[in-house]
């Protein structure tokens, strides 16, 4: 059984800090361990991952790590599975948020002597305590004109006056740590001497060497001052311009004009308004230089007539965002019709052959123009130049079947033979123009052939029947050397095929006629009783009208088939003695004898001193050893036939005679004693 040595336990954890849920397992076989969170398998990430059997957290996350963890151990071989106790985190965290206006509903409604309530959107666990600041100075609870409610995280000003104007921020702390507001609130209670925004500058994008204008206006009593600064805090005035802003002009109404803009002029411009009282107001606007990148290439497209297709033009990156349009034959495409532009797409509805050609996507902005062509081909259904014809092909020669078609794009041609796809191999070859070549025609190639020519627009097909004109040939060719058994009945077959059924006849090679006991029956030479005189050379002649004749020569030998006069017997020999395995065979031609021992032929020239094969065929083995035991086969063969017979040889230890046994006691089994 699977046993947990260490189980995960619930624990406190700090947001963003390390943690470890331990799990250790003991099992009889190898197990693999995985973790569940609320019943679903935990996927490894860089933040949370398996470390051995335990689950390691590089940075605890209060959202992703809330829930119940469980360690599961599985023996993959047996399928046994065990589950640990559940464990969860009590995650301590604090998270910054903005200071927002709670009352009144909008800044426009803030008037002197109204109540203003701000809320600090810092949250955490455990609940933090809050501290408020105005312009960085802490506000203590119970001070005149304001109250702090820690529970609601609110600061209330009653009544609010110009003296409360300022930047309000808050901080909060808990056992976990501290956080301050991510966005602060500027309270501006109307004071005529404070500068107020009338017109704020906007971001501008211009082409190189063009001009750019920023507008900026403030109002106050008495009138406020206005100053322009560039990124590096250099003031811009009509009297003192920085070196890279020689062509800058500040107008009396506060507008800033830049002429012949260069890349070094791009950046952030700040307009600062200062009233008699109150803080300065800083407004920012950015000057961007227009740019446009190159467009990606299009792949050529092949469409079919009658279909609807779209080609998307991805606009190049640029500032400002480039506008995109399509052209064909130098004419801009409309936004409706059969071939039109929709968004960045070229749309071709109910495609016609005439729609083929080059379409151009254009993109342009202040920085310039880019273009990219796409070549559109409209596929057509193939048409016939030459269909395959019913054909007569000669056996053994190459044969050709045409399948010539034309279309756009170039059609692909495949061939079928008896409804089976022909794959190119050593016998079949499909040329580029679609013609099929059969390299060496065989009889069974006579069947139906079908070619199919296809483009994306469709396909056409045609079939033709092939008739094979057979060669005049022997089927099979007679064996050139054959044996017949003396004094027995024998037959020698000869058959042939051709375009017309051939006639077959036998004759002796010397032209002499066949004896009366030898008959020629439809190509089979029949010997009623073989005599020595029947040996010799014979010719089989096959002929028909259109193809002439062919001849096959056969040499017939008359033989007395092999019989064994003496066969080897099952033999048991004492170790160290001599074994004799006798074998004698007769036949005509006189048979030769070979021995096979333990599955290998015994070569008389390599037998060594212990073994010898006599002239009469017997095998003798001297000083026999246990490893000589096994089956021995006597093989008798001549030019006409072969026969074999076998017997086992057993080599045994010589028994030690017991007291009771006399010297003349016979051995317990048949022995050769030497």
């Amino acid at each position: 059984a699977i046993v947990f040595i260490k189980q995960p336990s619930s624990q406190d954890a700090l947001q963003g800090r390390r943690a470890l849920l331990r799990c250790e397992v003991e099992a009889p076989g190898p197990v693999h361990v995985y973790w569940l969170l609320d019943g679903a398998p935990v996927q490894d990430t860089e933040r949370r991952f398996a470390q051995g059997s335990s689950l390691s957290f590089a940075a605890v996350d209060r959202l992703q790590d809330s829930g119940t963890f469980q360690c599961v151990a599985r023996d993959d071989v047996t399928g046994e599975e065990a589950r640990s106790a559940n464990a969860s985190f009590n995650i301590k965290w604090i998270e910054a948020g903005p200071v927002v206006l709670k009352h009144p509903a909008s800044e426009a409604e803030i008037q002197p002597q109204t109540q203003v309530t701000l809320r600090c959107h810092i949250d955490g666990h455990p609940r933090p305590t809050y501290q408020w600041f105005r312009d960085g100075t802490p506000l203590s609870d119970g001070q005149s004109n304001h109250t702090v409610s820690s529970k609601e995280r609110n600061l209330t000003l009653r009544p609010a006056g110009p003296e409360h104007s300022g930047l309000y921020s808050c901080c909060a702390h808990s056992a976990f740590g501290q956080a301050c507001s991510s966005q602060n609130f500027t309270l501006s209670i109307a004071d005529e001497s404070f500068a107020r925004v009338v017109l704020a500058p906007q971001d501008v994008v211009v082409a190189r060497y063009e001009e750019a204008m920023f507008h900026c206006q403030f109002s106050a009593q008495p009138p406020p001052s206005l100053q322009w600064l560039f990124e590096d805090e250099t003031p811009i005035t009509n009297r003192s311009r920085p070196p890279h802003l020689r062509r800058a002009t500040v107008f009396a109404n506060g507008s800033l004009l830049l002429t012949q803009v260069r890349p070094r002029n791009a950046g952030i411009y700040r307009c600062i308004g200062q009233g008699q009282r109150g803080p300065p107001i800083i407004l920012e606007a950015t000057l961007h230089l227009a740019e446009i990148e190159d467009m990606p290439l299009f792949e050529p497209r092949v469409f079919t007539a009658g279909s609807e297709e779209r080609v998307t033009c991805l606009p190049p990156k640029g500032l400002p965002e480039p506008s995109v349009w399509w052209e064909h034959a130098g004419v801009r495409l409309p936004t409706h019709g059969r071939v039109y532009q929709k968004g960045h797409e070229l749309v071709l509805a109910n495609i016609a052959e005439s729609d083929a050609g080059v379409y151009t996507c254009h993109a342009a902005n202040l920085a310039g123009q880019r273009r990219q062509d796409v070549n559109i081909t409209v596929a057509t259904v193939p048409s016939w130049l030459k269909k395959p014809q019913d054909s007569q092909l000669e056996e053994g020669k190459p044969g050709y079947l045409d399948c010539l078609t034309q279309a756009t794009p170039k059609p692909t041609v495949v061939w079928y033979r008896n409804q089976m796809l022909i794959s190119e191999d050593s016998r079949f070859e499909v040329f580029k123009n679609g013609t099929l070549r059969i390299n060496s025609v065989e009889v069974y190639d006579g069947t139906w052939y079908r070619c199919m020519s296809s483009t994306p627009a469709g396909s056409i097909e045609a079939q033709a029947r092939v008739q094979v004109l057979e060669k005049l040939k022997f089927t099979p060719p007679p064996q050139p050397q054959q044996c017949m058994e003396f004094d027995k009945e024998a037959t020698v077959p000869c058959s042939a095929t051709g375009r017309e059924k051939p006639t077959i006849k036998w004759e002796r090679a010397d032209g002499s006629s066949l004896p009366e006991w030898v008959t020629d029956n439809a190509g089979t030479l029949h010997f009623a009783r073989v005599t020595r005189d029947d040996a010799g050379n014979y010719t089989c002649i096959a002929s028909n009208g259109p193809q002439g004749q062919i001849r096959a020569h056969v040499q017939l030998t008359v033989a007395v088939f092999i019989t064994f006069k003496v066969e080897p017997e099952r033999t048991t020999v004492y170790q160290g003695h001599t074994a004799l395995l006798q074998c004698e065979a007769q036949g005509d031609p006189k048979p030769l004898i070979q021995w096979k021992g333990k599955d290998r032929i015994l070569d008389p020239t390599k037998l060594g001193p212990r073994m010898h094969i006599f002239q009469n065929g017997s095998l003798v083995i001297h000083d026999v050893a246990p490893e000589d035991s096994g089956r021995y086969t006597c093989i008798a063969g001549n030019s006409c036939n072969i026969k074999h017979t076998e017997a086992p040889l057993y080599v045994v230890d010589k028994p030690v005679p017991e007291e009771s046994e006399g010297p003349g006691s016979p051995p317990p089994y048949k022995m050769i004693q030497t």
């Epitope: 996927q43 599961v72 047996t78 399928g79």
Partner: antibody, heavy 112, light 110 residues
Amino acid sequence: EVQLVESGGGLVQPGGSLRLSCTASGFSLSNYVMNWVRQAPGKGLEWVGIIDSSGSTYYASWAKGRFTISRDTSKNTVYLQMNSLRAEDTAVYFCARGLYLWGQGTLVTVSS
Amino acid sequence: EIVMTQSPSTLSASVGDRVIITCQSSQSVYNNNLLAWYQQKPGKAPKLLIYHTSNLASGVPSRFSGSGSGAEFTLTISSLQPDDFATYYCQGGYNGNIYAFGQGTKLTVL
């Protein structure tokens, strides 16, 4: 003796449903994971899904929605419910405990 | 979708040959080692040969061995025996209790 026996296979029409059973003996299902694996005629093995020791199920992407694995621990039996069957669902369906112990399989034929 | 690719799909060899079958996964298996090899003969259920990449299952001859890590694995038969002609499958286990088989390698007599 620990063994698994599948049953419930047979001929079903396309669009039809079938429920296969895998009855376990010699051990309790509640401590083991059980897999269903299928093999179309002349084709390779294809994992269908798994039910773990708690009864949670997980499936191959192609099996989600049509196939449902469940179990009845009192009967020590795991089930494979197959809906909207297609011709390509024709196969021998095996149940297996872990990697080692497999049933003999049951043939499902989907044909009209 | 996880794809496991075995190569070769078919393999002809002779008794005594050393045979290597490879298995490649489109993503890493769980723990980099959750991979098993099976042998299947016609009409029979698969038989487990190797689990956890390299551990020999009970009763499996030592001529079978496995190796690899992550997404690439091999099964080696050191000296092929007549009983080894069969189809072999790899099976990977993945994060999220998902498993997948290779398409199989048919080992036939040369």
